[in-house]
Structure formats: C-alpha cells, structure tokens
C-alpha cells in the first residue's frame, strides 16, 4: 500500500495515527471521528492545548496517546466527551501540572506522564496519591518534578482538601417556618463551592446567599417532606473535592394507618406510622395492652433512606381463635398522638355453642364472640374439638 | 443453614451468676425471629427460660423471672443469658434456640453449680 | 395453671401407631408443638401449629388436638422413633411458654 501523506493516517479499523511533524495544532475535525476508539499523535509541537472542543465527537475513544509533542495545557474538562478512555500517555510533552478534575469520572487503566517537566505543588497530591495507591501504572514511571526530585517524595502536609462546616438550627424546626444553613469552608486555593439540592424538590422555597468563603442557604416555608433529604455543600481546590451533607428535621406530630389483616407465610396486621420524631407504638388488643412474644410481635420492613414514614406487620404466628378481635395501633411523639384500629378474624372459635354437642366450658383468655369476615379456617379443619362437659 | 453454638463457664459457685453465650451463624440475629433460652436438669424434662428479639422486647418464665436477664448483641451475631443467685438446682444443660418454634438448637452446654 | 401434662412412658410395637398426649388448659387456646430428644442430644422438633412438619421430619409424625389434649400420633413406628418427646405451647396468658413432663416412647 502507498504510503499515507495526510497529516493523520487510517491505523486498523478504527484507530488513527497522526504522526507527520507539526501538521497538527488542534484535534479539531479529526477524519472518521465518531468510530475512533483508538488516537495516537506524536511530534505535534503546535499541538500545545488540549480543551473540551477538541474531543468533542469523540465518545467511543478507549485509548488516547499524545507524545513528542508540544502539550502545555490540558482542561479540566477536556475529556468529558470521553468518558470511556481507557489508556491516556501524555509523556514527553510540557506538561507542569494536570489537574484532579481532568481524570474524575473516567476509568483510567493506565495513565502515562513520564517525560513532562512537572512541577511539583499540592495541585499534583492526587499524583502522587496514584503513586503511593499503585493506580494507573505510575509507581512505575518513577515521575520525576522538574528540578524538585521524585513525586512521591513531595511534603504533603499541607494539601488537603476544602474543609466544610455547615451550621443547622439546633432549634426544633416546624412546618412552615424559614431555616437558615451556612456553611463555612476553609483550606488553602479555593476555587468553587456550592450546594447540591436535588433532594428538596417541593420540601421548600431555596434562597441561596453569599459566596466563598461563607455560603448561606434559607429554606423557606418547609414541609415534614424536607425530612431525611439530605442538604449538600461542596468546595474544591488544586487538590480535590469536599462535600458535607446535612439534614433538617421538621417536626410533626405522628399519623397511623391499619390495614385488613393478610395470610402470608405468618399473619401479618399491615401498618404505616409517621411523624418526627419517629413516634413510639404501643398495640391494645381488645382494649387491653398487648405484650408482644416470639408469637405474636412487631416487625419493621426496611426503611427507606429518603423518608420518615415506616411500614411493617403485627405478625401473628400460627394464629388461633383467641387472637381474634380488635386490634389498635397507639403512635405517639411530643407533637401529638394518633390511633387506628381494625377487627381481625384469624380461624373459628372452637367453642361455638352447638345444640348436639356437650356444653363447652371455654377457658380462652379474652372474649372471642365477636369477628369479622369469613373465618379463615373451616370448623372442620379446626385443630381443637370439643370434648369437655359440664355436670 | 442457622447455627447456634453456646460457650460460657461450665462451673458457676452457688449464690454466683450463671453467663452464657450463643453465637448465631447462617442467618442474622436481627431477623424476623425471637432467640430463646432453655434448660434441662440432668434426668429431667426441659423448661423455658425466656426469650428475646432484635429490638429488645424480652419475656421470662415467671418463676425465674427475678433472676434472669437476656440481652442482645447485635453487631457480634449473639445474645446472652445471666442468671443470678444460682444454686445446685440450676444445674443443667442450657440450650439456646430460635423461637417460636425451636426449630433450630444449639447442642447444649452443661453449667454445674458447685462450691 | 400453667401446666402440660405426659404419660411417662409408652411403648409401641415395630410399625404399629402409637399417639402420645398431652393435657393442658392452655391447649384450648394455643397450638401445641412437639420435640424429639435422643439421650445426649439436643431436641429436635418434629411438629409444629396446626399440624405442621418441618423439612426433613418423616410424614409419619402427625399432630392433632381435640378440646385441652393435643397428640402426636406415629403412624408405623421405626426404631430410630425410640426417644423422649416433649410437648409445648404457651401459657394460657400468652405471655410465656411450658412444657410437658415429657414421655420415653420405647419401640419394641
């Protein structure tokens, strides 16, 4: 085949190749962009600066290597476009720096720099934090700062991350009223901060306030939603990324909720309960206090993370005809009280008065004459027959 | 498949406190079932002790309930018995099991109450 | 009063029924489950609520309750049935739970 004269040549089926001496100052309009999965420029020392634009349209690029160039600068963002790459080699170029932000979010297997005259300050602590880790492939490149010594030998006391305090009200918080959260970061090269509030939704009206170092945050008008929804501030220097998360608790009284009683591999008396905080349950059985056993007990499903309400079962184990009645779920937290009650019906009373049976003399604890429903077990297939008469 | 396994002193003095251990395995002890204690008198039938779940509700066999404490302990998979002011008459095997139907036991620790 | 009451001892035939019972007030209320015990063994449990058997307890062992007595009943006894059995339930108050005496079934 004819040697190729472009400045950048077809490599297998879907790599390229752009080798010819200084043809290249930008990756722009790159033949065949959309299928590469593999780039490979070497001797390019216009190609000085590498931003987001340039690897645009590139989204099925695994394996990028820029070489023997002239790479100055390279965006935070440049690979955003990218984010299966896999393999990056920067090496012999001019790089000083490479900033955290430029690797976040992909998957690199291997991350080439050797060759660069990097300078070593705080902005490369996370570098060096591949090093020490063993990610990447860079212990082995042994990365050398310019007239400074090895990488892995940097002081790094002082390059730590954004610090963040986020300041709540310790006041109880109502439905309805405004809450002001600040939060203050600290640390050396702040760049950015913020709040993440994707949780909130309708929870309340969002004011934000301020700006470094002292963020504040109202919420105003609040609602018992904004509860477990966490409240996020976040920071970022040279040397990575700070998030702290909070959450507000709004106090509201407790609410309960009583379904009909269902068979499963046990009984299980369905209930919802609510309020904050979380209130406390007590069953009646009857009008009287249940004491809970392995036979006859509370259980809570799994809550979920983002909320107050929980669910879960009076569950009853193999149930008799002295469990039927009315059952009443008591939920209470400093902010009021509620109840809910429901009649259950687990099987017959074996004890029924039967004109040709003996006269029964029924020793069951509480008074079984009312259900409701269908019983569930036929008399017939009641375990207990009546044989005790009296006189 | 759930294991129960006791371990504790096999000789507690009298007027002493009888501690016993069992450690849950194959199954967490933060599940949908209560854990029980029961004991047996060399030669004799078995008797309840008492019983607890995850979330602390507890109950006692009345004529020990003076004596006896059940805890749980959650992040170590075991809950534990004490009996207190023990005398000869609590010489047993202690079995610990899975209530409520003592489906699954543990093979029993004899504890012998001597000075 | 909070009390499951056994025959001491029965016997049974190779391969012929044998029902052992037990009598308690709290049995008109309460399911009765039932235990196998083998000397130096811990119990084992063969039947449990409204009849029921756990995996791996053959169908021969049933249970049944008629007024204050509950029963299990060995349909064709083997010789590895030959063990103490114990019955239980909870207390007439719900609150705690009793056993039997127990009862030495011996297998002839």
């Known amino acids: 085949a004819a040697p190729c004269p472009d400045a950048c040549c077809p490599h297998g089926s879907s790599g390229l190749r752009c080798t010819r001496d200084g043809a290249l100052d930008s990756l722009h309009h790159l033949p065949g962009a959309e299928n590469l999965t593999e780039l490979y420029i070497e001797n390019q020392q216009h190609l000085q600066h590498l931003e987001l634009r340039d690897l645009r349209g590139l989204g099925e690029l695994r394996n990028l290597t820029i070489v023997k160039s002239g790479l100055r600068f390279v965006a935070p963002d440049a690979f955003h476009f990218t984010p299966r790459l896999s393999r990056l080699n920067l090496s012999f170029n001019a790089l000083e720096s490479l900033s955290w932000k430029t690797v976040q979010g992909l998957s690199l297997q291997e991350l080439v720099l050797s060759g660069n005259p990097l300078h070593c300050s705080c902005a490369l602590r996370w570098l060096q934090r591949w090093e020490e880790e063993g990610l990447g492939g860079v212990p082995e490149q042994k990365l050398q700062c310019h007239g400074q010594g090895p990488l892995a030998h940097m002081p790094n006391a002082s390059c730590g991350v954004p610090t963040l305090k986020v300041q709540v009200p310790n006041a109880s918080v109502d439905v309805g009223d405004d809450v002001l959260l600040r939060c203050q970061v600290e640390g050396r090269g702040l760049e950015q901060a913020g709040w993440i509030l994707t949780e909130l939704e309708q929870s309340a009206t969002v004011m934000k306030s301020g700006g470094l170092p002292s963020l504040g945050l109202t919420l105003a008008n609040v609602t018992s939603d904004l509860n477990r929804k966490n409240v996020t501030c976040w920071a970022e220097n040279d040397v990575g990324r700070a998030e702290v998360s909070v959450q507000v608790n709004v106090s509201f009284p407790a609410s309960v909720q009583l379904h009909t009683a269902v068979e499963m591999h046990h009984w299980c008396i369905p209930f919802s309960v609510d309020g904050q905080p979380a209130p406390s349950l007590r069953w009646l059985f009857n009008g009287s206090v249940l004491n809970e056993t392995s036979f006859i007990f509370t259980e809570f499903l799994e809550p979920a993370a983002n909320e107050t309400v929980r669910h879960g079962c009076l569950r009853l184990n193999q149930p008799t005809h002295v469990n039927n009645g009315n059952y009443t779920l008591l939920a209470a937290n400093p902010f009021g009280q509620a109840s809910a009650s429901i009649m259950a019906a687990f099987m017959d009373n074996p004890f029924e008065f039967n004109p040709e049976d003996p006269i029964p003399v029924s020793f069951s604890p509480v008074d079984t004459n009312s259900t409701s429903g269908d019983p569930v077990e036929k008399k017939d297939e009641t375990p207990f027959g009546v044989s005790v008469a009296v006189g | 498949e759930v294991q129960l396994q006791e371990s504790g002193p096999g000789l507690v003095k009298p007027s002493g406190t009888l501690s016993l251990t069992c450690a849950v395995s194959?199954?967490?002890?933060?599940?949908?079932?209560?854990w029980t204690w029961v004991r047996q008198p060399p030669g004799k039938g078995l008797e309840w002790i008492g019983e607890?779940?995850?979330?602390?509700?507890?109950n006692y066999n009345p004529s020990l309930k003076s004596r006896v404490t059940i805890s749980v302990d959650k992040s170590k998979n075991q809950f534990s018995l004490k009996l207190s002011s023990v005398t000869a008459a609590d010489t047993a095997v202690y079995y610990c099991?899975?209530?409520?139907?003592?489906?699954?036991w543990g093979q029993g620790t004899l504890v012998t109450v001597s000075s | 009063s909070s009390e499951l009451t056994q025959d001491p001892a029965v016997s049974v035939a190779l391969g012929q029924t044998v029902r052992i019972t037990c009598q308690g007030l709290?049995?008109?209320?309460?399911?009765a489950s039932w235990y196998q015990q083998k000397p130096g063994q811990a119990p084992v449990l063969v039947i449990y609520?409204?009849?029921k058997r756990p995996s791996g307890i053959p169908d021969r062992f049933s249970g049944s309750s008629s007024g204050n007595t509950a029963s299990l009943t060995i349909t064709g006894a083997q010789a590895e049935d030959e063990a103490d059995y114990y019955c239980?339930?909870?207390?007439?108050?719900?609150?705690?739970?009793?056993f039997g005496g127990g009862t030495k079934l011996t297998v002839l």
């Open positions: 099991a899975r209530a409520p139907w003592f489906d699954y």
């Open positions: 607890i779940y995850h979330r602390g509700n507890r």
């Open positions: 709290s049995l008109r209320s309460y399911y």
């Open positions: 239980a339930s909870q207390a007439s108050s719900g609150n705690h739970l009793i």
């Open positions: 194959g199954g967490s002890i933060s599940s949908s079932n209560w």
């Open positions: 609520g409204k009849n």
